[in-house]
């Protein structure tokens, strides 16, 4: 293990994992979830691991698959995260902030359709505010930069420098409330092109721009069926 | 396991169109784009264009007035058709799978153009 | 269009030498991904996402850079390395290629 940083070579003794990808180099590499330790030896944070998408290694942040869990919920809920690992969930802004805090991440973003097609973008760059004193206080800003099609279209660059919404925490650029508006939680600007965390409402729907929509892929009037989004260190 | 078989018309004449299948197996067309890419002979690589695993097409812009790129995902084959050839349009055509970048590819179909 | 301009065009190495082909790019792109093709045969994806193994490639092989700049490097050569190499950026479309270089073993 020469070579390897301070902070890291103590996690890796201690089998105190940051992320997926320290996870993946003590020899774990099925799918599954995992505890990792964003915020220090004492708190454990269950995740799920891809370990298989292109190359896995792949902290998930965001699954959502059939809609038994809703995503349309408080600050505090998704400051803190809510779910579980092995199912619907969602990290938490916190933890997300301290991951990338500590490496820089690439993002990948996985859809899929009620027609069983599968569709992916991916983000070289992905931060939740960097150089806050306070991220929760900065809003848990969103940067993503450096987009790669892979079917999907761009829909997640219009939010980036935006800070994160809730219904009972309105941060967004819109005169009214986007994420009441488009039942919903995130990086709003006004209000959105991707939705995910938006209601689960299981292929087209009437409503306008409420569902887990992708604009640049299903537009505004489909919700997806599958949604995760995941980073890994860059 | 991932393969993608290419068939086509070795000769074609100058001004006539082009049209090449590209069927795979070991992968759902649902789950996975397919790009084209050709090869002059001696020269290097140039991108085509790529269907989408929904049926949305991306193409190159200098070819895309006589390019068309479809598919059946149920028959798992996936089709290009080119019109309006030229001789410099004789190349070696390869159909390739995407995810991660351009994982897998065709073995390549040898297009000559020539009266 | 991004243009990719790599260099050298053509090298020839000792086997045993490390050998650097870079890749520059007329804009800023994402990612880098390179190829490898040896004569008769199909591409095969080498490096994906700039520094990424594809499924068998030698560790000897490893990929790096960023916005305009990046390179494939080869840390001590071999026999079955001589092939062409070659860039492609799918930041925006259309995609493109680099030219290509051509390593030949000595």
């Known amino acids: 293990v020469s070579g390897i940083r301070g902070d890291a070579l103590e996690r890796f003794c201690l089998q105190q994992p940051l992320d997926c990808d320290d996870i993946y180099a003590q020899g774990y590499q099925s799918d599954g979830v995992y505890l990792i330790y964003p915020s220090g030896p004492s708190v454990p944070v269950p995740v799920f691991c891809d370990m298989t998408t292109e190359g896995g290694k792949w902290t998930v942040f965001q699954k959502r698959f059939n809609g038994s869990v809703s995503f349309f919920r408080g600050w505090n809920d998704y400051k803190l995260g809510f779910g579980r690992a092995d199912g619907e969930y969602w990290l938490g802004l916190q933890n997300m902030h301290l991951l990338t805090l500590k490496q820089k991440y690439e993002l990948r973003v996985d859809l899929e359709d009620f027609e069983n097609n599968t569709a992916y973008a991916k983000y070289a760059d992905f931060s939740i505010s960097p150089n806050a004193v306070s991220a929760e206080e900065d809003g848990y800003t969103l940067f993503v930069a450096g987009f790669e099609d892979g079917g999907a279209g761009d829909s997640l660059s219009y939010h980036s420098g935006q800070k994160f919404s809730t219904f009972d925490r309105d941060q967004d650029l819109f005169v009214q409330n986007c994420a009441a508006l488009s039942s919903g939680a995130f990086w709003f600007r006004s209000c959105h092109f991707a939705n995910l965390n938006g209601f689960y409402l299981g292929g087209s729907h009437l409503s306008y721009a409420n569902g887990i929509n992708w604009a640049q892929w299903k537009g505004f009037y489909y919700s997806l069926k599958r949604t995760e989004m995941k980073i890994r260190r860059a | 396991q991932v393969q993608l078989e290419q068939s086509g018309p070795g000769l074609v004449a100058p001004s006539q169109s082009l049209s090449i299948t590209c069927t795979v197996s070991?992968?759902?067309?649902?789950?996975?784009?397919v790009h084209w890419v050709r090869q002059p002979p001696g020269k290097g690589l140039e991108w085509l264009g790529v269907?989408?695993?929904?049926?949305?097409?991306n193409y190159n812009s200098a070819l895309m007035s006589r390019l068309s790129i479809s598919k059946d995902n149920s028959k798992t084959q996936v089709f290009l058709k080119m019109n309006s050839l030229q001789t410099d349009d004789t190349a070696m055509y390869y159909c390739a799978r995407d995810d991660p970048s351009m994982a897998y590819w065709g073995q390549g179909t040898s297009v000559t153009v020539s009266s | 269009d991004i243009v990719l301009t790599q260099t050298p065009a053509i090298m020839s190495v000792s086997p045993g030498e490390k050998v650097t082909i870079t890749c520059s790019a007329s804009s800023s792109v994402s990612y880098m991904h390179w190829f490898q093709q040896k004569p008769g045969t199909s591409p095969k994806l080498w490096i994906y996402s700039t520094s990424n193994l594809a499924s068998g490639v030698p560790a000897r092989f490893s990929g790096s850079g960023s916005g305009t700049s990046y390179s494939l490097t080869i840390s001590r050569t071999e026999a079955e390395d001589a092939a062409t190499y070659y860039c492609?950026?799918?930041?925006?479309?259309?995609?493109?290629f680099g030219g290509g270089t051509k390593l030949e073993i000595k």
């Open positions: 492609q950026q799918r930041s925006s479309y259309p995609y493109t």
């Open positions: 070991g992968f759902s067309l649902t789950r996975y784009g």
């Open positions: 269907i989408w695993t929904a049926g949305n097409t």
